[in-house]
Interface confidence: medium
Amino acid sequence: IIPVEEENPDFWNRQAAEALGAAKKLQPAQTAAKNLIIFLGDGMGVSTVTAARILKGQKKDKLGPETFLAMDRFPYVALSKTYSVDKHVPDSGATATAYLCGVKGNFQTIGLSAAARFNQCNTTRGNEVISVMNRAKKAGKSVGVVTTTRVQHASPAGAYAHTVNRNWYSDADVPASARQEGCQDIATQLISNMDIDVILGGGRKYMFPMGTPDPEYPDDYSQGGTRLDGKNLVQEWLAKHQGARYVWNRTELLQASLDPSVTHLMGLFEPGDMKYEIHRDSTLDPSLMEMTEAALLLLSRNPRGFFLFVEGGRIDHGHHESRAYRALTETIMFDDAIERAGQLTSEEDTLSLVTADHSHVFSFGGYPLRGSSIFGLAPGKARDRKAYTVLLYGNGPGYVLKDGARPDVTESESGSPEYRQQSAVPLDGETHAGEDVAVFARGPQAHLVHGVQEQTFIAHVMAFAACLEPYTACDLAPRAGTTD
Amino acid sequence: IIPVEEENPDFWNRQAAEALGAAKKLQPAQTAAKNLIIFLGDGMGVSTVTAARILKGQKKDKLGPETFLAMDRFPYVALSKTYSVDKHVPDSGATATAYLCGVKGNFQTIGLSAAARFNQCNTTRGNEVISVMNRAKKAGKSVGVVTTTRVQHASPAGAYAHTVNRNWYSDADVPASARQEGCQDIATQLISNMDIDVILGGGRKYMFPMGTPDPEYPDDYSQGGTRLDGKNLVQEWLAKHQGARYVWNRTELLQASLDPSVTHLMGLFEPGDMKYEIHRDSTLDPSLMEMTEAALLLLSRNPRGFFLFVEGGRIDHGHHESRAYRALTETIMFDDAIERAGQLTSEEDTLSLVTADHSHVFSFGGYPLRGSSIFGLAPGKARDRKAYTVLLYGNGPGYVLKDGARPDVTESESGSPEYRQQSAVPLDGETHAGEDVAVFARGPQAHLVHGVQEQTFIAHVMAFAACLEPYTACDLAPRAGTTD
């Protein structure tokens, strides 16, 4: 399909002249950020961004690539180097430490410098690094964590936890020897390390004692509480704050977010990770956009401002399954949340960053015609005289041999939400990729987001923009928090 | 390998504070660019940039990812949307039209709006679009084209040619019917469409009549002249300019570049594309860095300034072969040329842009240890109990089945320059990828390079920065050309 309009050079020249005009008008704000939002697309490499743009555009009956994601509208872009201290290709724990605490760590550790060693409890103490969220709280701001994964997952945990093993969700996951050495599970740290005003996502089962039935799945024992210490962490958290409210479904969330008596809100909507957006029961579970809106309603009451972490955490899971349909629909919901947040906040006082922790070995090739489905087939056949999809993975569970050969694929098969794109190497889970990821920035001090940077730079930009430790002498006016 | 200094949070905090300090000091220059340089890494997607950074770092005995490419030092970054009017995933012809002329075209056409149709000669006339190089020449600047491909290849041709078929290198490649309709081959257009001061690269055979032996390979008939019209285009070009010089080897190039009587220089160092850097005969053929230096020596004599196109054109070819070794070593030489150009020019008066025309379905995954070879194996085994490489392709010629199964691979095999990384789908040539590519910018008006842009924006930024058509009323001081 060749759009008639695009045949005319004037179309492109006019469009570029407008873009130039907008670029010339960009004025770096010299003010501090009252509010900080970091949107984290877990596994959202540049190939995911582009494919999601096309899909989102096509869902609006456009050809696709000419449209804009919400994040595309952010005026400043940088590239972020994601390696961890010990690996070229990182995990979500070490990267969370980088972009939330400003220090690089080791693979599968969280909130700890690289002096800590994976799974070695005794290397924890003294190596803790403090997140920007924690520093924002100390400065009198309200803070929140929103994710589509469990709230104890690696990325959100970077905002509040310190652990040598990202998999220590509840005490049942922590070896007895480590528990004896004083290493706490992530769920315990969620409620005890710092005061978090808003906590929204999945992860109910890690908060309740073993044997506690789940309210949504009371007959499914595997979904119930997992804790061995007999603690009801939700109860403990509620007891800390007079205005605290715990919710576990969408209806309760929407009510609580509008209730002025609620000062602290914890919403845990699934026992583990939240459901993929395409599987979500919209009567029971809120979308990421709805959780983001609820968080902003609460947090924005604070005249000193807020810090909010919003994660599209299951983009990564879709890719690990080699199911691009899931990864890309998750990315679109993530982008919808960014868009909604933009409507609810002002770029005059809110620094918003969008980034990824790492990429995936996910590619989009094959010379497909403009307007053709992102999940479709490439024109022509492969060397084995079979069709192939435009989306493919370097490695992952999509690798299958059928009668000693690569399976053929039809357009209807490849368009299925369950379809796993083929890969070069068979793995149970497709892996992360190590290339640089994009950082998109808007708001006060967003102009500092430039060039190629270490991933740690992100945390430092946020801290500087809001005049938080170690940048309290930031020399920005109006100083953060002057509105109270 | 965990570097001891990186275990200390102070290392990361100090580094980030320095980066913040540098970011705060960035001052958008309000002056015009006297000179324009566009460095085009053909097929150099973000995954290629990161992998090349690691390789270049390791060649300097560093761990890799913590090091800097020359392009990494450019202060401004944007993302460029590379689709062509008719394809989600473009080719180098349509993209060259975008970043050199500022207008998007159709797949495999060059220097024409999308009203032109591939291979249909009669759709050429009236649909020509004019490159920034051409506009620079009209403004009195000197102009040059440097590439590791043949100089008539798609990317450089975007600077001077208008053709409905990128493969029409010489008249022997143009169907008789199209010749009769008046469609000219690219080699002819190279010498007749505009006055180009410096032309360096490959592509000798397209300039000489059929039967003319090649000076380097006189006994290889397939490397000799291909022209059917009996023309010696080099002779015709030399006759146009009193100070014109033609060279075909490195020694002659170095001599000519230092000769003040040479005003125009054409150097064609191979019959077709230049050799891969790893195959280059350094006594006969110059490197991309050397060609770039020679071009800058000549062009910088013009007090009105210059426009220079420098292409690392065989990054793309390495990827098409699924030979990452070739692609990445080409990228390093490309980066070396960027570095050398930076030493020979000033960012006070020279706008330098680095970008790619498109990406490739090339990925870097598998959780390798820091410091391990980029060409090495991932830790552990795949589901088929065989080793696999960290570098892989979505599709391409690296797909092989051995006895109905994926072949095993050893570290020594994967480290070979000839090794083809495995792919999910078997193709004769690995394909381009459609995700956004990076644009790196330095110099006057580089700050305009921001956010997510159409690829066409690149040409417009260059034109605006140097006050060329259609931005002659650019209102920048000092105005371009005031130094003559």
Epitope: I1, I2, P3, V4, E5, E6, F11, Q58, K60, D61, K62, L63, E66, T67, F68, L369, G371, S372, S373, G376, E411, G415 | -
Partner: antibody, heavy 123, light 106 residues
């Protein structure tokens, strides 16, 4: 040149069904989105239904007022667009137009229209 | 669903007058708006799409502008043959027409 010719209109009683056709020529039918739009006497235009092209699997969309009663379909071998209208109401009285979208840069604007066919629903 | 509010519903003007019609969308429609002219007994005719792009053969006295939610259609110098009803159409999210503006000569 692009031509769209609607047929099948006429007088029909409330509660009954009617099928409209739109015969297309002058373009590759399968490449384009097709829509039905109606205009009640003396009133404005109302978009009713859309059927997408081959590349997007011929998926359909409807405006709320006709969803469940009207069905858009296409016979690609004959280049004919259909609108099956069931459980007709008096308020469905209108001139019915078929329209073809054009893929400009900006999406799916309704660029080509038929001359319309009048449907009168009355007892 | 995106709603389009078109105003005025009717207007009377003299030949040579500058005429302006506005459409307001219920949400940002990203410039995806078209303007149509319809004469009695005829099908609508596309004049402008993507806010401001004139269809081939449409006189240059017709123009469009706007962004976000607010859009304007202008006839710079009204001609007798311009007497018709004009509709806006958003096509950002499926399709929605404005209510129409009936243009008459004074």
């Amino acid at each position: 040149e692009v031509q769209l010719v609607e047929s099948g209109g006429g007088l029909v009683q409330p509660g009954r069904s009617l099928r409209l056709s739109c015969t297309a020529s002058g373009f590759t039918f399968t490449d384009y989105y097709m829509s039905w739009v109606r205009q009640a006497p003396g009133k404005g235009l109302e978009w009713l239904a859309l059927i997408r092209n081959k590349a997007t699997g011929y998926t359909t969309e409807y405006t709320a007022s006709v969803k469940g009663r009207f069905t858009i379909s296409r016979d690609n071998s004959k280049s004919i667009l259909y609108l099956q209208m069931n459980s007709l109401k008096t308020e469905d009285t209108a001139v019915y137009y078929c329209a073809r979208a054009s893929f400009y840069y900006d999406g799916k604007v309704l660029a080509y229209w038929g001359q319309g066919t009048l449907v009168t629903v009355s007892s | 669903d995106t709603q389009m509010t078109q105003s005025p519903s009717s207007l009377s003007a003299s030949v040579g007058d500058r005429v302006t019609i506005t459409c307001k969308a219920s949400q940002d429609i990203n410039k995806y708006i078209a303007w149509y002219q319809q004469k009695p007994g005829k099908a609508p005719k596309l004049l402008i799409h993507y806010t401001s792009t004139l269809q081939p053969g449409v006189p240059s006295r017709f123009s469009g502008s706007g962004s976000g939610r607010d859009y304007t259609f202008t006839i710079s110098s009204l001609q007798p043959e311009d007497i018709a009803t004009y509709y806006c159409l958003q096509y950002d999210n499926l399709y929605t027409f404005g209510q129409g503006t009936k243009l008459e000569i004074k």
